[in-house]
C-alpha cells in the first residue's frame, strides 16, 4: 500500500521581510526519504530543484534554497513540493516574501521572524503524484 | 546516463600531494551534494568527505582521518569535483571513488581511481 | 562517531536459499540507513536507502527492514549473481559510517 505523504512546510531565514540586497533562505520540509525539494515561485511558473537534503530531525529532511542578494523582483509568493518514490507531495502553504527598501537608519523594522505557514492556504493539488522530476513538463525557469 | 569520471590517481610517496578530480555529466551536478569515499586494498568502505551545494553555501565535512589534509571542493560551471591530498600517508593508499549522493547516502558512483602511497 | 557492526563477516549458502545480513548500529539512526552490493573489481552499487526503500531496477528478492539501531538485509533466494560483498551504511550523522562487509559465496 502506498503511503500517504504528508504536505511540506516552508520558512525563510532571517525572515519573511528582507531588505534589498540582503540575503534570504528558504528551508523545505518533509518526512524522511525525500529524493528532490522543489521550491516554486507564485503558481508553478518558475522552481528550482534540489537533491542536496539533509537530516534535519528523526522524523524530518529538509533543504535550503538561498538567494544570495535579494531584488524586489524576489519578491512574491513561494512554495515547497517534494518528491518522495515514486510520488510528488502535495505542495505547501504559500510563503510570502517582501522585499523593502534599504533605509539604514537606526528606526528601520527588523525582519520578520521565519514563518512555517502563511496566510495563504493553496487549492488542492494532486497533479504532480506519479511522475519523477525529470519528466515535470514545468519550465525550470530559475527563480534566482 | 549518470556518468562520473574519477582522474589524478597515482603513486606518490608519503608526505606528498596529489589532486583528484571527477567529471560529472547526466544530471544537474550543481543541485547535488557530492562526495568522496575510498577503499583500501582488500578493506572495506569508508566516507572520506561531502560538500553541499550552493545553495547550503558549499559546506564541507570530513572524516577524521583526513580532516586538515584533504579538502573537497566543486567547480560548477565545469561539473567537476576535487580532492586535494596533502601530507598524504602510507594509510592513504585506496581506491577513491567519486559519488553523487542523496541525503547521506551514496547513489552514483564512478569507476574509482587508484591513489599509492609508497616511498 | 556511531559504530556500524554487521554480521556475519562471510558466509556460504545455496542457490534459492534466504540470506539473511544484520547491522547494528551503536545508537539509533532513524532508519537514515543503506545497503549496498559490491562485486571484485567493481564499483558498489546501492540496493536499499531508509531502510526499506528498495532503489529503481533493483530485484525484488532484495529487502530490508529494521528501526533504531537494529537492522536486517534480507535476499529471499539466492540466485549465482548475488554473489558479492554487502554493506550496511549509516546516514543520520556525520562522519557517514559503513559496517564492515559481509561476504557472501555459493555452496
Known amino acids: 500500500q502506498e503511503e500517504d505523504l504528508p504536505r511540506p512546510s516552508i520558512s525563510a531565514e532571517p525572515g519573511t521581510v528582507i531588505p534589498l540586497g540582503s540575503h534570504v533562505t528558504f528551508v523545505c520540509r518533509g518526512p524522511v526519504g525525500v529524493q528532490t525539494f522543489r521550491l516554486e515561485r507564485d503558481s508553478r511558473s518558475t522552481y528550482n530543484d534540489t537533491e542536496d537534503v539533509s537530516q534535519a530531525s528523526p522524523s524530518e529532511s529538509e533543504a535550503r534554497f538561498r538567494i544570495d542578494s535579494v531584488r524586489e523582483g524576489n519578491a512574491g509568493l513561494y512554495r515547497c513540493i517534494y518528491y518522495k518514490p515514486p510520488k510528488w507531495s502535495e505542495q505547501s502553504d504559500y510563503l510570502e516574501l517582501l522585499v523593502k527598501e534599504s533605509s539604514g537608519g537606526p528606526d528601520s523594522p527588523d525582519t520578520e521572524p521565519g514563518s512555517s505557514a502563511g496566510p495563504t492556504q493553496r487549492p488542492s493539488d494532486n497533479s504532480h503524484n506519479e511522475h519523477a522530476p525529470a519528466s515535470q513538463g514545468l519550465k525550470a525557469e530559475h527563480l534566482y | 546516463e549518470v556518468q562520473l569520471v574519477e582522474s589524478g590517481g597515482g603513486l606518490v610517496q608519503p608526505g606528498g600531494s596529489l589532486k583528484l578530480s571527477c567529471a560529472a555529466s547526466?544530471?544537474?551536478?550543481?543541485?547535488?551534494?557530492m562526495y568522496w569515499v575510498r577503499q583500501a586494498p582488500g578493506k572495506g568502505l569508508e566516507w572520506v568527505a561531502r560538500?553541499?551545494?550552493?545553495?547550503?553555501?558549499?559546506?564541507?565535512y570530513y572524516a577524521a582521518s583526513v580532516k586538515g589534509r584533504f579538502t573537497i571542493s566543486r567547480d560548477d560551471s565545469k561539473n567537476t569535483l576535487y580532492l586535494q591530498m596533502n601530507s598524504l600517508k602510507t594509510e592513504d593508499t585506496a581506491v577513491y571513488y567519486c559519488?553523487?549522493?542523496?541525503?547521506?547516502?551514496?547513489?552514483?558512483w564512478g569507476q574509482g581511481t587508484l591513489v599509492t602511497v609508497s616511498s | 562517531d556511531i559504530q556500524m557492526t554487521q554480521s556475519p563477516s562471510s558466509l556460504s549458502a545455496s542457490v534459492g536459499d534466504r540470506v539473511t545480513i544484520t547491522c547494528k548500529a551503536s545508537e539509533d539512526i532513524y532508519i537514515r540507513l543503506a545497503w549496498y552490493q559490491q562485486k571484485p573489481g567493481k564499483a558498489p552499487r546501492l540496493l536499499i536507502s531508509?531502510?526499506?526503500s528498495l532503489e529503481t531496477g533493483v530485484p525484488s528478492r532484495f529487502s530490508g527492514s529494521g528501526s533504531g539501531t537494529d537492522y536486517t538485509f534480507t535476499i529471499s533466494s539466492l540466485q549465482p549473481e548475488d554473489i558479492a560483498t554487502y554493506y550496511c551504511?549509516?546516514?543520520?550523522?556525520?562522519?557517514?559510517?559503513f559496517g564492515g562487509g559481509t561476504r557472501l559465496e555459493i555452496k
Open positions: 531508509t531502510a526499506t
Open positions: 559519488v553523487r549522493g542523496g541525503s547521506g547516502f551514496f547513489a552514483y
Open positions: 551504511q549509516q546516514y543520520w550523522s556525520t562522519p557517514y559510517t
Open positions: 560538500i553541499r551545494s550552493k545553495s547550503s553555501n558549499y559546506a564541507t
Open positions: 547526466g544530471f544537474t551536478f550543481n543541485t547535488n551534494a
